[in-house]
């Protein structure tokens, strides 16, 4: 028998520095977690103690903090090189700055193979990107060879900006021939490493003949055997065992997100490459694990540029940006409109001639808007200003909801109106009218939504049985502010870009902004 240790991360999302327990900015260092310096300490400890170790990343290193905004992926290559990752799969967020924003900072600089078997380049891009990412890589590990086959969510064109010259194929269809090829070349230990979410990971384990282990990402799935060490609630045991169609027991793993945990899986193979046993657990990277001093020093060196960036002007406003709780928790506020407009603008994807865009709607809890921005400071807007408006380090995500769920959400928005509570929704691509004289749960009297399958966008009444795409904060997607119906009834959820980054990009693009209060949210006569 031969034993392999797989160390894995996924959805790190630019958390190079240690973070608080909820993966936001570290405040009290003695209680902070994760970060590449701490990760390196643990990885090195395991590498020294065990003979056959692979360090893998399942995608979405890009996007999530000011580190990515400023360094644009160069920080990912640099620190992943320093940690000596053995392989990485491409995630959807790796395409957030377009293909060039992937090629130059990461693909050309990474000193580890970057993988995806289901992304095929065409046209002029094919020769430009040739060899920069691979469908698979065969690695020598101790006395054996291990094949690693990559995959990426085929939804990426709707979630990011891969352009028109990359085709995202069905994962299973693309993986099978690559695995078959490796088998014919006597590679009998194969790991599928990818970024399509836990449901697809399980399907790959079930359907792709010859895959021995699946290491996944995208869905931020936390798996654990025994008593979990922090706040995350396990979605199942670690590893999650799937019985394949050909009768094999295939371990599937994922390690939550944000570099909070290091996945740790031990696999025992027989001489024919069959998995005999698998066990392990994610390791919580808490403050009991010291940060490596040399990596920490490097982080501090790279940090300097971030501090300078946060005070630079992104653009100007010529109007007061009303982000006060007195406005945003009671009525339409122009800060809410600005943020929603930025959210939609960030999700412009012309992937189908029948649609002017794949999504037109935005909802945003008023309680998530934490500060106004005064235009009387020469109109200047900085990252620092935006960090005061959106201090929680969240993301603006894409969900699919039925009309009936949206109606419930808008009823919840005003079910206890007048108490300055955070659930009052700011909107984009939606016209809502409330009648507060009616009883809670029956106050939405008009709800019109902007069409997507149209050449001239116009507002049509919401249809209860239709499925709609909506951009919203991850806080709402996770049921925050009492929006349990969103969490319980959403049909799909894909994590998006860092909230501040979305707004800062929009402001930089527009240069000068002047958002108005324009009648997106109305109250019927006599009730307000």
């Amino acid at each position: 028998a031969w034993e392999l240790t797989i160390l894995h991360t996924n959805d790190v999302h630019s958390r190079l520095e240690q973070t608080s327990e909820d993966s936001s900015k570290c405040v009290n260092a003695s209680r902070c977690m994760g970060g590449v310096a701490r990760l390196f300490t643990k990885v090195q400890q395991i590498r020294r103690a065990e003979p056959n170790v692979l360090l893998l990343d399942a995608g979405d290193q890009y996007q999530g903090t000011i580190w990515f905004t400023v360094y644009k992926g160069a920080e990912v290559a640099h620190f992943m090189n320093a940690l000596r990752y053995d392989a990485m799969a491409l995630g959807n967020h790796e395409f957030d700055n377009g293909v060039e924003g992937l090629i130059e900072p990461l693909l050309k600089e990474a000193k580890f193979p970057i993988l995806s078997a289901n992304i095929k380049a065409k046209g002029p891009l094919a020769s430009q990107i040739s060899g920069l990412y691979l469908p698979y890589k065969v690695l020598p590990v101790g006395d054996e060879v291990v094949g690693i086959v990559g995959y990426t969510s085929k939804e990426t064109p709707f979630l990011s900006n891969p352009g028109t010259n990359l085709v995202f194929e069905d994962e299973i269809t693309a993986l099978q021939p690559e695995v078959d090829k490796l088998k014919t070349l006597n590679v009998n230990k194969i790991i599928a490493l990818g970024h399509s979410g836990f449901e697809m990971d399980k399907l790959i384990a079930q359907k792709v003949r010859g895959v021995d282990v699946v290491v996944g990402g995208h869905s931020n799935t936390f798996l654990y055997t025994g008593n979990p060490p922090s706040k995350e609630v396990p979605a199942g045991k670690y590893p999650f065992i799937v019985t394949s169609d050909d009768g094999r027991k295939v371990p599937v793993v994922q390690a939550y997100a944000f570099g909070k945990y290091l996945g740790y899986l031990k696999i025992e193979f027989d001489e024919r490459g069959n998995v005999i046993s698998s066990h392990g657990n994610p390791i919580l990277l808490n403050s009991s694990i010291p940060e490596d001093p040399s990596i920490k020093a490097d982080i501090n060196k790279w940090r300097i540029k971030l501090d300078n960036y946060s005070t630079q002007e992104l653009g100007k406003t010529i109007v007061y940006l009303d982000g006060s709780s007195q406005s945003c928790r009671f009525r339409e506020c122009n800060m809410g409109n600005l943020i929603c407009d930025a959210m939609i603008n960030n999700n412009l994807r012309h992937t189908d001639e029948m649609f002017w865009n794949h999504v037109s709607m935005c909802i945003l809890n008023g309680g998530g808007i934490r500060s106004p921005i005064d235009e009387r400071n020469n109109g200047t807007i900085t990252w620092e200003n935006l960090a005061a408006v959106l201090p929680f380090g969240g993301t603006f995500d894409l969900v699919q909801l039925k009309g009936s769920t949206l109606k419930k959400a808008f009823e919840h928005s005003v079910h206890r109106y007048g108490q300055s509570t955070g659930e009052f929704l700011q909107v984009g691509g939606i016209h809502v009218v409330y009648d507060l004289s009616r009883k809670p749960g029956d106050r939405v009297v008009k709800l019109d939504v902007l069409c997507t399958k149209c050449r001239v966008p116009s507002y049509d009444p919401l249809k209860m049985d239709e499925v709609y795409k909506v951009i919203l904060p991850n806080f709402l997607a996770n049921g925050g502010d009492g929006f349990q119906m969103i969490k319980d009834e959403l049909l799909r959820h894909d994590s998006g870009d860092q909230d501040i980054n979305v707004v800062s990009t929009y402001i930089s693009k527009m240069k000068v902004i002047y958002p108005a209060v324009e009648g997106r949210i109305k109250f019927s006569t006599g009730s307000h």
Epitope: R47, N52, R84, K111, G131, K137, V138
Partner: antibody, heavy 118, light 107 residues
Framework: QVQLQESGAEVKKPGASVKVSCKAS????????MDWVRQAPGQGLEWMGD????????IYNQKFKGRVTMTRDTSTSTVYMELSSLRSEDTAVYYC???????????WGQGTLVTVSS | DIQVTQSPSFLSASVGDRVTITCKAS??????LSWYQQKPGKAPKLLIY???RLIDGVPSRFSGSGSGTEFTLTISSLQPEDFATYYC?????????FGGGTKVEIK
């Protein structure tokens, strides 16, 4: 700068064994695998095998399986290649070569000529 | 094992010429192809890896291209120091295998 210093030329009788050394300097020895390649007089290059200096793991070309042994000594940053049951067709220059992150051979030793003759 | 066939075996050219050497693998090698230059009595020197990535310090007149099973090394304008033997090698799977070599001679 990266340097790979190989041991001196050897003359061996058929049936004997030879052990060639390769001392590495200018980089972290355990961070890169080492390959061995040989070249018979006037001929092309032939890959013999690979050793991971970190854990001593080896992958050999089946053609040499049972005859070749690759080892390492981390205290001196040296790898060794021993070839046994020598025959005349093993007369060749033997090179050690460091592999880069992608496993291409980016730095080579100067070569050790092994002559097998009765 | 994957077979790697290099052509031509010999090539006569003049300084300033554009020279192309091809390498064919018996099956798709996933861009895992390197090119080496060897001068008489010396060890090989890595020029290009991953089919088209030029090693630091190697003159830009050298370039690699190709994917799948067919690869090319091009020297855009041959210089006196480029007369040598060139080898391609696949490192997609084990055992690693080399092409038979192309000797570039002065015409």
């Amino acid at each position: 700068q990266v340097q790979l210093q190989e041991s001196g030329a050897e003359v061996k009788k058929p049936g004997a064994s030879v052990k060639v050394s390769c001392k590495a300097s200018g980089y972290t020895f355990t961070d890169s695998n080492m390959d061995w390649v040989r070249q018979a007089p006037g001929q092309g290059l032939e890959w013999m095998g690979d050793i991971n200096p970190n854990n001593g793991g080896t992958i050999y070309n089946q053609k040499f399986k049972g005859r070749v042994t690759m080892t390492r000594d981390t205290s001196t940053s040296t790898v060794y290649m021993e070839l046994s049951s020598l025959r005349s067709e093993d007369t060749a220059v033997y090179y050690c070569a460091r592999t880069n992150w992608d496993y291409a051979m980016d730095y080579w030793g100067q070569g050790t000529l092994v002559t097998v003759s009765s | 094992d994957i077979q790697v066939t290099q052509s031509p075996s010999f090539l006569s050219a003049s300084v300033g010429d554009r020279v192309t050497i091809t390498c064919k693998a018996s099956q798709d090698i996933n861009s895992q192809l390197s090119w080496y230059q060897q001068k008489p009595g010396k060890a090989p020197k890595l020029l290009i890896y991953r089919a088209n990535r030029l090693i630091d310090g190697v003159p830009s007149r050298f370039s690699g291209s190709g994917s799948g099973t067919e690869f090319t090394l091009t020297i855009s304008s041959l210089q006196p120091e480029d007369f040598a033997t060139y080898y391609c090698q696949q490192y997609d799977v084990f055992p690693r295998t080399f092409g038979g070599g192309t000797k570039v001679e002065i015409k």
